[in-house]
């Protein structure tokens, strides 16, 4: 019979024949032959392979180094790598999360639009007219100016993006 030019899913072509790939969590020891099946071996502890494969070496689990602010989000297995994230108050510097940096704070005049997570930094936005922020914070949103009218008071000092309005009593008409 003609040797195959393509193989089924979870197979690979070698020496003009189709061999079974090794399942996730196992590595290739020897290719199949006309008489024998593919030989696979489980990955060692702290190693993994996450696909059907013909790899002769397993990959090492990622180390979530606490000295870099990292912690484990998902423990590695024979079929999956360890997933790292950052300690509270920190976020990853890259998608691979190999190190962490402190969450940015939003300066006075800016509020938090989106609170940081283990993988994304704080997103700040300028406080629009009618809102203010007088602190540097990684959590505080812009606060609305106080409404003097609802307290039967009048604006004595206008608000800014960094300060609230100052309310005062209404001037009484003298008799």
């Amino acid at each position: 019979p003609e040797p195959p030019t393509a193989c089924r899913e979870k197979q690979y072509l070698i020496n003009s024949q189709c061999c079974s790939l090794c399942q996730p969590g196992q590595k290739l020891v020897s290719d199949c032959t006309e008489f024998t099946e593919t030989e696979c071996l489980p990955c060692g502890e702290s190693e993994f392979l996450d696909t059907w494969n013909r790899e002769t070496h397993c990959h090492q689990h990622k180390y979530c180094d606490p000295n870099l602010g990292l912690r484990v989000q998902q423990k590695g297995t024979s079929e999956t790598d360890t997933i790292c994230t950052c300690e509270e108050g920190w976020h990853c510097t890259s998608e691979a999360c190999e190190s962490c940096v402190l969450h940015r704070s939003c300066s006075p005049g800016f509020g938090v639009k989106q609170i940081a997570t283990g993988v994304s930094d704080t997103i700040c936005e300028p406080c629009p007219v009618g809102f203010f922020s007088n602190v540097s914070s990684a959590f505080e949103k812009c606060h609305p100016w106080t409404s003097c009218e609802t307290k039967d008071l009048v604006v004595q000092q206008a608000g800014t993006n960094k300060t609230d309005v100052v309310c005062g009593p209404q001037d009484r008409l003298r008799a």
């Epitope: 996730p24 489980p42 990955c43 502890e45 702290s46 998902q74 079929e79 999956t80």
Partner: antibody, heavy 119, light 113 residues
């Protein structure tokens, strides 16, 4: 037959140090991750530390971080736990446990060694 | 840290009965890569070290009788012992094997009526 035998426990004064050992036999020690887990008198189980088969990966519980050091000697089939700055709350039975590369669970436990921290 | 909550804390039982205990985790124990729930059950008899009973939520360790059944997913898990035997009197601990720090429930103690 898999065997894990802990030793090195005893009475220690607060602030003192102690080094625990766990002698492994009946399996290829260098192929397995290892854990220390403790159990305070009449209490539940508390994970303490982990070391991977090849010494590359080490994790600690926050309660012992900076005070305890896990290590292993694959040539001597022995796991260690160096404990410093001991506190009364470290009083417990300390177990070593094996983690394989398939289940990723603690599949064998030693009998434990008792550490008492008291003045 | 993942908090593991077991209930009840103790159960008074008789031989031959069916026993069910619960374990809840404060976050999902589902590994997104291989779709396995990393929930482990250990059995600890008086004066003995813990013994692995069930891993991946429902897979019995070799040598564990089939009267022990683990079930559940995500955050809610159950251990069932059907036709309870005297030798099953022990404390049963569920454990988060999903992430570090590894955390244990406070245990469910089975006592004879």
């Amino acid at each position: 037959e898999v065997q894990l035998v802990e030793s090195g426990g005893g009475l220690v004064k607060p602030g003192g140090s102690r080094k625990l050992s766990c002698a492994a036999s009946g399996f290829t020690f260098s192929d397995y991750g290892m854990h220390w887990v403790r159990q305070a008198p009449e209490k539940g189980l508390e994970w303490v530390a982990y070391i991977s088969s090849g010494n590359r990966i080490i994790y600690y519980a926050d309660t012992v971080k900076g005070r305890f050091t896990i290590s292993r000697d694959n040539a001597k089939n022995t796991l260690f736990l160096q404990m410093t700055s001991l506190r009364s709350e470290d009083t417990a039975l300390y177990y070593c446990a094996r983690q394989d590369g398939y289940r990723y669970a603690m599949d064998y436990w030693g009998q434990g060694t008792s550490v008492t921290v008291s003045s | 840290d993942i908090v593991m909550t077991q209930s009840p804390s103790s159960l008074t039982v008789t031989a031959g009965e069916k026993v069910t205990m619960s374990c809840k985790s404060s976050q999902s124990l589902l590994n997104s890569g291989n779709q396995k729930n990393y929930l482990t059950w250990h059995q600890q008899k008086p004066g003995q070290p813990p013994k692995l009973l069930i891993y991946w939520t429902s897979t019995r360790e070799s040598g564990v009788p089939d009267r022990f059944t683990g079930s559940g997913s995500g955050t809610d898990f159950t251990l069932t012992i059907s036709n309870l035997q005297a030798e099953d009197l022990a404390v049963y601990y569920c454990q988060n094997d999903y992430t570090y720090p590894l955390t244990f429930g406070a245990g469910t103690k089975l006592e004879l009526k």
